[in-house]
């Protein structure tokens, strides 16, 4: 990563905790931990107080004296209070929280079944290419490529677990070795932690509410990411996973047994058929270097059909391929035999949209992703709103002490554990570790779970994937049991092997301080959180699978020098941060080298420049949807997008401290300020505030 | 209807060779195998090879390999057996005879050709 | 090579009698035997294939039998026009070989 100052705002110290939280965070009282705030130096430091010349804290919080961005914030109870109320009201009151409950429960429902859907669409853009990274075995023996084939495959089809059946596959049939298949499971497991930090960019509305989120989806692209920089080279040096699975095949003998109840799909399969069906097989074909398979289309178009098992003579290359003498014969030049010859039959299509349209996989599956990232943006909107205006007061209140409230002293460090079997549990309820990830993002975002409950219960989510995994190895069969039983367990040691390295102690809880330097970054330049994911996601793997075609000397030759560039800055980064005095002067800070390169402020500039010309295009649109939304929401004062005035005129309203967001790469600023006086007869729900940064209204 | 006319009765001296031909009516050509056997006076019946006239593919007798050539004319749906380096005991009536499709009984016969062989 | 040995070489039997001829493999062929029936100075004529599929226009009284390595052919009353050679054909592999045929006479 660039040296950016910005990320000095991550937390850097792993013993501060939340502190908006209840309960018993620290040892420190509430009232005593502004004072308890310290320097390098131990010296106490004020909020408001500027840290030393090489931190860059300053770039980045906003916020106003006294708080901190990461505290949660407090859900204030902005209705009138029950007692008040008279029966009317109150009926009125129990009806609304029934309808709210019952709209969060259909959005939920909405939510998930348009990220399945947003699965399929990945598959029909990418699937087939995704095959086709496996079909080149040359390539998955260096084990760089291989994990970086994981990334972009399971980012292409947006399921690990397609990947690991493709992966099984290969490794069931000899096409793939299962040391081969490590990293690439490693990969697969990266390019999993991609779909919450999609999610997260929908709620890029709300600076704060978009630090939390975003900081609580990347928590695990980072543990994932630093699990894989320390594992990958011990996997390859000593073969641990391996030799460990192994051991674990060997001791225990498994026999053959039920999958993990689909207790999820079993709900939203009837709604996600009817939109579209997929034949993931094809993909399979695919990777396993079948070459007709690249003219088959991925979309299901057959549903129901008959298998028939009809005896037929077929002629076979010698006798050795018979059965038996009695079922072989010659016609005097061919060897004939009778095989039992399967013929499908087709009864009835299936029954989703796309079944009678003609059109290419490419087209289906752009559609499908433009609807199912406007659909699932809507959700989370809807979501957040309705959360927002559920969990106020007392709720929140119960809510956010149930979650976040650590055991009591000297059991407060079972609590994170606990955390991660919830998280293990939820998933495998759900039977995805994508679907409980993403859920669980926008309570991050409007702040019912902090970042530090968040990271175990996204390691435990980590660990239940891997559950269903192992399951559905032992549902295998026979011939590919131990295959994929062997690769589930790599997967699963590979999740507790990073928990053993990023959890248990406090300090080494890496991924947390990251995620919030990432959060903090995104929070100021949300383009940056844009980039980070093409770049991590699909730039970097991309590359690398690039430099992998042309051999191992170029990988070498080209990654070494960046890896040790990195280092190098890692290294200045930490000395600049412990202990500057031992650097000469113009080291202590980046101001050495050119802004550019040490502050995302000129890109900043760079981004708005080009995104300002689409803005004011697409503005006058937006105010035009703005007053729609209000109309449909009954919201009287509702304030629309300012963005057809003058850039002047912003920077006035931005001075004159009038809460219009500032014109950034995603900014709207649609309906940005709720109507507190709406709150009595109005659904709080529909009362909107800071609808998104989203173009989607 | 089926009908396979052999050519006429032939007398070579040993080491000659022999053509003899087979012409078919009656049916699709190229999708049956055709096969000859021999008859050698007052004996059994003793098979020498087959032809697929669809590929030209054949299969000979172990016995007779390096000596016989099957070959097939699809234009004029027309089959030939060669018999080379000719001996006395090669003296025989040869038939065509159409193998059924996918084994090898052969349902339909030419007439017959009579080689003699004799110094 | 499969030899097939065909019992009895010569049989003289009646009109309107019941007649078997066996036919024995050297080894399993299945069911991939053939029965002709050959008249002096003409080409053998297909009976049955398959041990026991009579072949088109072929007269219910001929029928085969037997699996593996021991077939029979029964004429199960012997007409005039029956008195010829018969000859078994296996056809489990190559080369295709017959049997020394029996030859049917009358009594």
């Known amino acids: 990563m660039a040296p950016w100052p910005e990320l000095e705002n991550a937390q850097p110290n792993p013993g501060k905790f939340i502190e908006g939280a209840s309960g018993p965070q620290s040892s420190i009282p509430a009232k005593d931990k502004e004072a308890s705030k310290t320097n390098d130096n131990g010296t106490p430091v004020a909020k408001t107080e500027l840290l030393p010349s090489y931190s860059a804290l300053v770039l980045i919080e906003e916020h106003p004296e006294g708080t901190d961005p990461w505290d949660l914030p407090e859900l204030q109870d902005t209705g009138i209070k029950w007692s008040e109320r008279d029966t009317k009201g109150k009926t009125l009151c129990i009806f609304q929280g029934v309808g709210k409950f019952i709209l969060l429960l259909g959005f939920l429902y909405l939510f998930v079944c348009s990220l399945d859907v947003l699965s399929s669409a990945f598959q029909l853009v990418g699937g087939k290419v995704a095959g086709q990274f496996f079909s080149n075995n040359s390539i998955m023996s260096n084990p760089v490529a291989g994990l970086v084939i994981g990334v972009l495959v399971t980012v292409m089809v947006q399921s690990s677990s397609t990947s690991s059946s493709i992966i099984v596959s290969m490794v069931a049939s000899s096409l793939l070795t299962v040391r081969a298949a490590i990293p690439i499971i490693m990969g697969a497991n990266i390019g999993t932690s991609i779909t919450n930090t999609i999610v997260a960019l929908m709620q890029a509305g709300d600076r704060n509410e978009f630090r939390r989120a975003f900081a609580g989806a990347t928590v695990h692209d980072f543990f994932n990411w630093l699990s894989v920089f320390v594992l990958l080279p011990l996997e390859a040096a000593t073969h641990y996973l391996e030799i460990l699975t192994n051991l674990v095949l060997e001791t225990f003998k498994f026999q053959n047994g039920e999958d993990a109840p689909d207790i999820l799909k079993v709900i939203t399969d009837p709604f996600t058929k009817l939109i579209i069906q997929l034949d993931k097989k094809v993909i399979q074909q695919i990777a396993m270097g079948d070459s007709a398979a690249q003219n088959k289309s991925l979309i299901k178009i057959w549903c129901k059909s008959i298998t028939n098992v009809t005896e037929m003579n077929v002629t076979v290359p010698s006798t050795d391929n018979c059965t038996s003498p009695s079922y072989c014969w010659t016609d005097g030049i061919q060897t004939w035999t009778i095989q039992n010859v399967t013929q499908k039959e087709n009864i009835a299509k299936c029954q989703h949209i796309f079944v009678n349209f003609s059109l290419p996989d490419l087209a289906v599956g752009i559609i499908l992703l433009t609807v199912s990232l406007v659909v699932l943006c809507g959700c989370l909107i809807m979501i957040v709103k309705l959360l927002g205006s559920v969990l106020r007061g007392q709720v929140a209140t119960v809510i956010k002490k149930t979650l976040n409230t650590d055991f009591p002293f000297p059991f407060a460090w079972l609590t994170g554990y606990l955390a991660i079997l919830v998280g293990a549990g939820m998933t495998f309820i759900v039977q995805s570790s994508s679907v409980f990830t993403s859920a669980m993002t926008p309570l991050i975002g409007i702040g019912v779970i902090s970042i530090e409950r968040a990271y175990p219960l996204t390691l435990g989510s980590n660990i239940g994937t891997t559950t269903t995994a192992i399951l559905a190895a032992l549902a295998s069969p026979g011939n590919t049991l131990r295959s994929s039983l062997q690769i589930a367990l790599c997967h699963f040691f590979f999740n507790i092997s990073g928990i053993l390295l990023w959890y248990p102690i406090p300090f080494t809880r890496l991924p947390i301080r990251l995620a919030k330097g990432l959060g903090n970054i995104s929070a100021k330049y949300r383009w940056f959180a844009v980039f980070y994911l093409i770049f991590f996601f699909f730039v970097t793997p991309l590359t690398v699978f690039g430099l992998s075609l042309a051999g191992w000397p170029v990988l070498v030759g080209v990654g070494v020098p960046i890896i040790l560039l990195l280092l190098l800055v890692l290294c200045l980064r930490m000395l600049q941060f412990r202990c500057p005095r031992i650097l000469p002067l113009k080291l202590r800070d980046w101001n050495f080298l050119p802004l550019w390169m040490h502050s995302l402020k000129p890109w900043d500039n760079v981004i708005s420049l080009a995104t300002t010309c689409f803005q004011r295009r697409c503005c006058c649109c937006c105010r035009v949807c703005c007053r729609v939304c209000c109309m449909v929401c009954g919201c009287k004062c509702c304030r629309c997008s300012k963005c057809c005035r003058d850039q002047g005129e912003e920077e006035e309203e931005k001075e004159q401290d009038i809460p219009v967001k500032a014109s950034g790469a995603f900014d709207n600023a649609a309906m940005s300020k709720e109507c507190q006086d709406e709150g009595k007869g109005q659904v709080e729900v529909l009362s909107m505030k800071a609808l998104s940064n989203t173009t989607v209204f | 209807q089926v009908q396979l006319v052999q050519s006429g009765a032939e007398v070579k001296k040993p080491g000659a060779s022999v053509k003899v031909s087979c012409k078919t009516s009656?049916?699709?050509?190229?999708?049956?195998?055709m096969h000859w056997v021999r008859q050698a006076p007052g004996q059994g019946l003793e098979w020498i090879g087959a032809?697929?006239?669809?590929?030209?593919?054949?299969a000979y007798n172990q016995k007779f390999k390096g000596r016989v050539t099957m070959t097939a004319d699809t234009s004029t749906s027309t089959v030939y057996m060669e018999l080379s380096s000719l001996r006395s005991e090669d003296t025989a009536v040869y038939y065509c005879?159409?193998?059924?499709?996918?084994?090898?009984?052969?349902?339909?016969w030419g007439q017959g050709t009579l080689v003699t062989v004799s110094s | 090579d499969i030899q097939l040995t065909q019992s009895p070489s010569f049989l003289s039997a009646s009109v309107g009698d019941r007649v078997t001829i066996t036919c024995k493999a050297s080894?399993?062929?299945?069911?991939?035997v053939a029965w002709y029936q050959q008249k002096p100075g003409k080409a053998p004529k297909l009976l049955i294939y398959?041990?026991?599929t009579r072949h088109s226009g072929v007269p219910s009284r001929f029928s085969g039998s037997g699996s593996g390595t021991e077939f029979t052919l029964t004429i199960s009353s012997l007409q005039p026009e029956d008195f010829a050679t018969y000859y078994c054909q296996q056809y489990s592999s190559n080369p295709l070989t017959f049997g020394q045929g029996t030859k049917l006479e009358i009594k």
């Open positions: 009656g049916y699709t050509f190229t999708t049956n195998n």
């Open positions: 005879a159409r193998g059924m499709y996918g084994h090898g009984a052969m349902d339909y």
């Open positions: 032809i697929y006239p669809g590929s030209g593919a054949t």
């Open positions: 080894q399993d062929v299945g069911t991939a």
């Open positions: 398959w041990a026991t």
